[in-house]
Amino acid sequence: KNLKSPQKVEVDIIDDNFILRWNRSDESVGNVTFSFDYQKTGMDNWIKLSGCQNITSTKCNFSSLKLNVYEEIKLRIRAEKENTSSWYEVDSFTPFRKAQIGPPEVHLEAEDKAIVIHISPGTKDSVMWALDGLSFTYSLVIWKNSSGVEERIENIYSRHKIYKLSPETTYCLKVKAALLTSWKIGVYSPVHCIKTTVENELPPPENIEVSVQNQNYVLKWDYTYANMTFQVQWLHAFLKRNPGNHLYKWKQIPDCENVKTTQCVFPQNVFQKGIYLLRVQASDGNNTSFWSEEIKFDTEIQAFLLPPVFNIRSLSDSFHIYIGAPKQSGNTPVIQDYPLIYEIIFWENTSNAERKIIEKKTDVTVPNLKPLTVYCVKARAHTMDEKLNKSSVFSDAVCEKTKPGNTSK
């Protein structure tokens, strides 16, 4: 009886694992083996595919074959018993195009209200992704084990910290990789769970902000308790993108080591141009807090994010505020080539009760004012990029009196 060729050959490539699967054409024939040949583009001869010769099952692995993953390859298969079937040719394919990204490795560390997630490519030193190692981004799904309500976090890198969690709570998450340059989305990792710790005695510092004064950076933060010492560390932001490296060499800012105030001042030349992460830790001599949330600090934006300049036109029941570009020394306006949002704070001169307006426009109306009353206004600019989240310092306050009661038109 003539052997029939196998059919429905599927090629599965996940990272550097090359798997072939096929259907037997004739289930009634026993003791049949299968063999594959391959052919590279531009070659006439067929070569035996190592790892896929005389296979008794309907699956084989040819990962050991050292292929150029960007080069097209053709496969053929036949069945063998006493005689052989005709060859069945598989559509040619390029391994890189066909490859899927495998599940990443995930390593979790817990604090009281945060989880640190370290993500590594599933295949170390992968040949398939050798040119794309730094292009991987990851997304994750996280949920409280008790509730199951999922939160998705997109576009993260090989180290990510999730804050504002509950102490003594089990969180579960799964992660997948993506190569956006090649339109590839990977498969999810297994689910990993970790329990946050009991609440720490000392909370971390909060609301860290950087501003520029003269030739210095001023770093400020809030803290719950008095009589503390603080230290500040920095890290190049690009280091979070380094795949497989999970040793982050945070560096001290010398002028911000063991400071006793909730701010420190250090020269701008401490940092070369670039994007950095900053974090602050508190200590009372016996206990130490966990590190604060890490803030992103871009020297380029920080250096030029100056407080806005504005003019006020006073009416009886409102101010019209016109925001202009800030002035450098020499009175030349600064070109801000990134979108800004403006925070305007105003208050009655005789009162401490502040009101706030957030506005994207550069002309703003401050409504509901009393006639013939002195109001003070100050403003600052924020970048609209959530990741950079930079703010200028507030402008100096400008105080103006509203007009008498009949000039609102």
Epitope: H107, E109, E111, H118, T197, L247, K249, F290
Partner: antibody, heavy 118, light 107 residues
Framework: QVQLVQSGAEVVKPGASVKVSCKGS????????MHWVKQAPGQGLEWIGR????????KYAPKFQGRVTITADTSTSTVYLELSSLRSEDTAVYYC???????????WGQGTLVTVSS | DIQLTQSPSFLSASVGDRVTITCKAS??????VVWYQQKPGKAPKLLIY???YRVSGVPSRFSGSGSGTEFTLTISSLQPEDFATYYC?????????FGQGTKLEIK
């Protein structure tokens, strides 16, 4: 493969100094931290300090601050521990260890016995 | 400095026994705890890091757990080669500190 090879045993007099070396191979020491750990005879482990060979930044345990100096020579992939004003309680085995991913001391040298004796 | 207290300091057990060593930290260290095994005349060997992650090549009978201030190392079924001294260490804050050690002896 990763290896840390330390210099040989030393016998030194009280008040003197000693410099122990640790040569790394199979990895680039600039990509890691390098730690030193003390173990007195029959005692437990004590962390002395560490260096970042990339920029020579050091951290020391307060107990050892001032009497020990950790240095690195990246051209020879070697780190050093110098102990000064030696006393009998400095008699111990000194280990170097590599600080790798997740800040873990993952590979250790074979240890160097320093004996302080008159 | 963060103190780590191991208990017991000495432990006698037999091959096949399940043993647990505990390590208590004087303050919350998250999951930043490491376990080492040391045999006489040898350097310490890393077993467990980040409280519960077993190092590649370490037998599955070794496991770690805990977070905050309380951590445990468990050996599910003692083998002859497991008799040694075990140390916990915190890597949450400088200076790094070790527990005083637990010497595991054959009963």
């Amino acid at each position: 493969q990763v290896q840390l090879v330390q210099s040989g045993a030393e016998v030194v007099k009280p008040g003197a100094s000693v410099k122990v070396s640790c040569k790394g191979s199979g990895f680039n020491i600039k990509d890691y931290y390098m730690h030193w750990v003390k173990q007195a005879p029959g005692q437990g482990l004590e962390w002395i300090g560490r260096i970042d060979p990339e920029d020579a930044e050091t951290k020391y345990a307060p107990k050892f601050q001032g009497r020990v100096t950790i240095t690195a020579d990246t051209s020879t992939s070697t780190v050093y521990l110098e102990l000064s004003s030696l006393r009998s309680e400095d008699t111990a085995v000194y280990y170097c260890a590599r600080g790798g991913n997740f800040y873990v001391m993952d590979y250790w040298g074979q240890g160097t016995l320093v004996t302080v004796s008159s | 400095d963060i103190q780590l207290t191991q208990s017991p300091s000495f432990l006698s057990a037999s091959v096949g026994d399940r043993v647990t060593i505990t390590c208590k930290a004087s303050q919350n260290v998250g999951t930043n705890v490491v376990w080492y095994q040391q045999k006489p005349g040898k350097a310490p060997k890393l077993l467990i890091y980040s409280a519960s992650y077993r190092v590649s090549g370490v037998p599955s009978r070794f496991s770690g757990s805990g977070s905050g201030t309380e951590f445990t190392l468990t050996i599910s079924s003692l083998q002859p080669e497991d008799f040694a001294t075990y140390y916990c260490q915190q890597k949450n804050n400088y200076p790094y500190t070790f527990g005083q050690g637990t010497k595991l002896e054959i009963k």
